[in-house]
Structure formats: C-alpha cells, structure tokens
C-alpha cells in the first residue's frame, strides 16, 4: 500500500481467483483514543471500533472511503483504491491500446517544433467516474522540470456501437534548449482512476522523435505563360522553430488526379517552390518533415489546380 | 578552423546532410524493435553530445563558432572510431556495400574539413570493452546509429545555418 495523495491510498493486489489479498491497517487521524467507530462509504454499518482498523483487501467491495467517527462526527477519511496485477502485469483496463507505432501504446505524444512544448493524448470508452493526473520530467534519476496543464476531453467519436473519448494534455519543458542534442528522454506519467480502480501509464521519448510539423501554409499556384506548367509555392508553418536557416524543413509534393487510383508522382525538395504540371480537376499537395531527422511528416496541405 | 579561421561552410553543409541520409539508411525508423533497443538512460551517456553550453545554437554560432565546431569535430572523430571498431567489424559482418562503410568515410571526411592536417584537438577516449555476443553487438550498433542520427542532425543544422549566414 502507498499514498497517492493526502488520505488516498493505493493497494496493490495480485489478481487471481482466491488470491489472499493484502492486509491493511487504517489509523484514525485524531488524538482521541476511545469511542471511535469505522464505516465504509455511505453504508452506516459499523465495521469495527478503536483507533485502528485492520482489513483484508481482496476485491473492489473492500475498497472505497473508510471513515472513522466519534459521537456521530467524522474524524478522518481514507480512500482505498485498487491497482490490479494479473500474471505479473499491471492492468490496463481504462485506456485503449492505440497500437501505433507499436502494440501497448496507450499514450501518444507529438510536438510541433523544438521549443520543448508537446501534447499527449489517450483514448478510453469510459464516460463517467474517471479522473486523470499527469506528471512529466526530463530523465528519471535526476529529473529536470516539465510543467503540464490540465487534462481536457479533446474529442468524442462514435466507433460502431461504442463511444470513444480522447483526452489530452499540453506540457512544456521548463528549461528547453531547442538547438541541443537531447541526452535524456522526456518521461510522461499518467494516473487514471475509474471508480475505485487505479492504473498508471507511462511514455518515454525524445522531443526529436515526436516532432510532427504543422502543414505548410499559404500554398499558391501561378500559371506559367504558354505552358501547361504552374509555379507552386508555399511557406513554413508559423508554429515551426526559427530561424529556418537553422531549423530547416524538407518537403514532399504531389499532384493528385481526380481518381484516387491515378498514379501520383512524389517529388522531394528543400525549396519552398516548384514547377509542376497541374491538370484541371487535379489538386496539388505538399507536406513537411524535419530536413535532418526523420521524424513524422506533417499532414498534407492541398489546393485545387483549377 | 583551429585558431579561428572559418570552415568551408557550404562543403560542410553538403557533407553533413549526406551524413544524415546515410545514418537513416543504415538504421531506418521502424514501428517496433525486434531486439529491445531501449535501455536505461545511462546507456548512451558515454557518447559525446552537443549540449546547451556548446555554442551550437544560432546566437552561439554568431558570437564564436569555434566552440561548437570543436565539439562537432570531437563527436565526428568519436563516432568514426566507433564505426571502425570491432562493434561493427565483428559478426554479423557488414557486406561490401554497407551504408556503415560510407558513413565511416563521410565522418572522416567531415572531420578533416574541420581540421586540416597538422592541427590536433584532443578527442574523447573511445570506450574499450566490446561485446562478445552477436546480439549484444547488434544492440550496441543500433544504439550507436540512433545517437549518431541525433548528433549529425544538430551538426547539419549548424552547417546549414553557417552556410546561410556566416559564409564570407
């Protein structure tokens, strides 16, 4: 058993049929010695008396808010949550495995630039009695500060018969150094509590590996005189790190015909303009990636050819 | 470069960008690792890193690029020695067209661009114990190539910025 925060405790249980559970001793936070009784949650049933209460915690029915009373007045509370371990593995019932980029990916994180700011998100099908808290640091043995904001419900989607909820959080490294080579990874820890179930999820990454630029902006097409060709141009996204002579992007461009099956030639360039053949009903698209490190490509930015 | 002269920024830019391409072709990003390549955070602490105080940011380069260039050169030589060591020469053997061979040559080429013959900056000692098992060797190769990718990315940014803003 360990203290999650004041008056909230997590009991770690090996979860299998007829498991013995954990013996827990609760102590009433009061100078009083006599006439103390204990109850669990809203039930008025007295579980025991005395300054301490010893219980055997085996299942969710044994978890909840234990209160010690004297003369009808509540003296202190202890909330017990359960953290299940099945076959040596902590339970992951609350969050959905996003399976990208690999199995057992519960938290996904992205950064739009090298400023030390990043966003993490996760998915669940649970809609009520759910709370999250997030902590983050750079490195774990001698952690450096990362500040995270409040967790927000960022999207709701219908998947078949189920509703899926996406939660996200934004974090910022306290002393970011965008030009340096990261040596220690960022660690993100999410605590999830659903009713009386506690779970924790972690992710470890370098900012450089989670970079995904915003799409290029300001796409423009300029037809060339007496030619089927057009000059296309675009700009770095506003959110990308500066100066661009240092934090450079590379681009992938393509002209997509009306039919999705039509062969599309992709051209890679470090410039912010190109000359292409852009037929009527086709569209021109461009995406960006860090020029020197193969992190994610941005989403496509597109403009119709006509 | 030693003694304060300027490097051939444009040449360094080209070669460092080639290094980036080679480093990624030698160890592409894959969705999952077949061998666990994540270790504790100390595993790559013995390789040189370009850190915050090394003057490799745009402002530091404008003030005095020498500190940064010295750091980059130390790293290049360190990685060049690693790629020539028995971590890479042992089993499983590199084939004649291995991108590691090209990487090795390009690391040497860029370090020489930064230091003409006759000047010698001190370089970090290469860690000597080399793994005996092929799987340990593979793991170490992946770790080295991953950290090399990060190192050459910063070096390439430095040279691109230098070529754009510091070239005479």
């Amino acid at each position: 058993i360990w203290e999650l925060k004041k008056d909230v405790y997590v009991v770690e249980l090996d979860w299998y049929p007829d498991a013995p559970g954990e013996m827990v001793v609760l102590t009433c936070d009061t100078p009083e010695e006599d006439g103390i009784t204990w109850t669990l949650d809203q039930s008025g049933e007295v579980l025991g008396s005395g300054k301490t209460l010893t219980i055997q915690v085996k299942e969710f029915g044994d978890a909840g808010q234990y209160t010690c009373h004297k003369g009808g007045e509540a003296l202190s509370h202890s909330l017990l949550l359960l953290h299940k371990k099945e076959d040596g593995i902590w339970s992951t019932d609350v969050l959905k495995d996003q399976k990208e980029p690999k199995n057992k990916t519960f938290l996904r994180c992205e950064a739009k630039n090298y400023s030390g700011r990043f966003t993490c998100w996760w998915l669940t099908t649970i809609s009520t009695d759910l709370t999250f808290s997030v902590k983050s640091s750079r490195g774990s043995s001698n952690p450096q500060g990362v500040t995270c904001g409040a967790v927000t419900l960022s999207a709701e989607r219908v998947r078949g018969d189920n509703k899926e909820y996406e939660y996200s959080v934004e974090c910022q490294e306290d002393s970011a150094c965008p030009a340096a080579e990261e040596r220690l990874p960022i660690e993100v820890m999410v605590d999830a509590i659903h009713k009386l179930k506690y779970e924790n999820y972690t992710s470890s990454f370098f900012i450089r590996d989670i970079i995904k630029p915003d799409p290029p902006k300001n796409l423009q097409l300029k037809p060339l005189k007496n030619s089927r060709q057009v000059e296309v141009s675009w700009e770095y996204p506003d959110t990308w790190s500066t100066p661009h002579s240092y934090f450079s992007l590379t681009f992938c461009i393509q002209v997509q015909g009306k039919s999705k099956r039509e062969k599309k030639d992709r051209i890679f360039t470090d410039k912010t303009s190109a000359t292409v053949i852009c037929r009527k009903n086709a569209s021109f698209s461009v995406q960006a990636q860090d020029r020197y490190y193969s992190s994610s490509w941005s989403e496509w930015a597109s403009v119709p050819c006509s | 470069v030693p003694g304060g002269s300027s490097p051939a920024w444009a040449q360094c830019q080209q070669l460092s960008q080639k290094l980036c391409t080679l480093a990624w072709s030698a160890h592409p990003l894959v969705g999952h690792m077949d061998l666990r390549e994540e270790g504790d955070e100390e595993t790559t602490n013995d390789v040189p890193h370009i850190q915050c105080g090394d003057g490799c940011d745009p402002q530091g380069l404008r003030d005095n690029s020498q500190f940064c260039l010295q750091r980059i050169r130390q790293g290049l030589i360190f990685y060049e020695k690693l790629l020539g060591s028995d971590i890479f020469t042992g089993e499983p053997s590199l084939l004649p067209d291995s991108p590691v061979g090209q990487l090795h040559a390009s690391l040497l080429g860029l370090s020489q661009l930064l230091q003409p013959e006759g000047h010698h900056w001190e370089t970090q000692q290469i860690p000597s114990p080399s793994p005996s098992q092929p799987w340990q060797r593979l793991l170490l190769r992946f770790k080295i190539l991953r950290s090399l990718q990060a190192f050459v990315a910063v070096a390439a940014r430095v040279f691109a910025h230098g070529a754009a803003t510091l070239s005479p």
Epitope: - | S25, A26, H27, P28, D34, L35, R36, E91, P92, S93, L94, L95, D97, S98, P99, V100, Q102, P134, W135, L138, R141, L145
Partner: nanobody, 121 residues
Framework: EVQLVESGGGLVQPGGSLRLSCAAS????????MGWYRQVPGKQRELVAT???????DYADSVKGRFTMSRDYDKRTVFLEMDSVKPEDAAVYYC???????????????WGQGTQVTVSS
C-alpha cells in the same frame, strides 16, 4: 552475395514428418527476420512461419501445432520441422531472410531457390 540454400524436401506420406533446412552464406544474426514460405503452382506465395532476431516463431494458422521453426546459429541454418503432414501442405517451400539495413545498401530481401515437398500415399 548473400545466399540461402534450402534442402530436405521430398516425398512424404500424409501424417508423416519431414525436416527442411535453410543454410545461409552469412551469420543468421545478419537477418532481422527469417521465414519459410510456400507456393503451389498458379497460387500466390504464402507465409508458413517467421522468426525475428531474438524472438520466438510465429506460424500461419494452417500449420500451428504441426510445424516447428528453429535455428542453429553455429551452423548458420534455420529449420522447418513438419509433422502430421497433410496433402494440402504439398508445395515448393522457400526460405527468406531480411537483412538488417546497416549491413547492406541493396537487396535487403534474400530468397532461396526452393525445395519441393510432395505429399502422397
């Protein structure tokens, strides 16, 4: 040039056993993944079993519990132990290896020439 050479194919009775071998010209640590595939004339090549470096084998549903893939690092060889053979197992069996990217700039996928397995009573 990296080569894979299969052997051990031949005639086997239904319910019988056969052991296929695939010898590599380089250390099998050179391969990120090694696999056995099979092909019947006029049909697409299908995956039978694969094994990753440091991993354990994965099998196609049709052979699970009957076939076993293993390797011998010292002999630079991978094996396919075929037990309880069925008529539908008859095919040309190919060995495949995918080389680690850092070992070569070309031809990451290496194939053997194949070995014929015939199932007949």
């Amino acid at each position: 040039e990296v080569q894979l050479v299969e052997s051990g194919g031949g005639l086997v009775q239904p319910g019988g056993s056969l052991r296929l071998s695939c010898a590599a010209s380089v250390s099998i640590w050179s391969f990120k993944v090694m696999g056995w595939y099979r092909q019947v004339p006029g049909k697409q090549r299908e995956l039978v079993a694969t094994i990753t470096t440091g991993g354990s084998p994965d099998y196609a549903d049709s052979v699970k519990g009957r076939f076993t893939m293993s390797r011998d690092y010292d002999k630079r060889t991978v094996f396919l132990e075929m037990d309880s053979v069925k008529p539908e197992d008859a095919a040309v069996y190919y060995c495949n290896g995918r080389l680690w990217a850092h070992l070569t700039s070309s031809g990451h996928d290496v194939w053997g020439q194949g070995t014929q397995v015939t199932v007949s009573s």
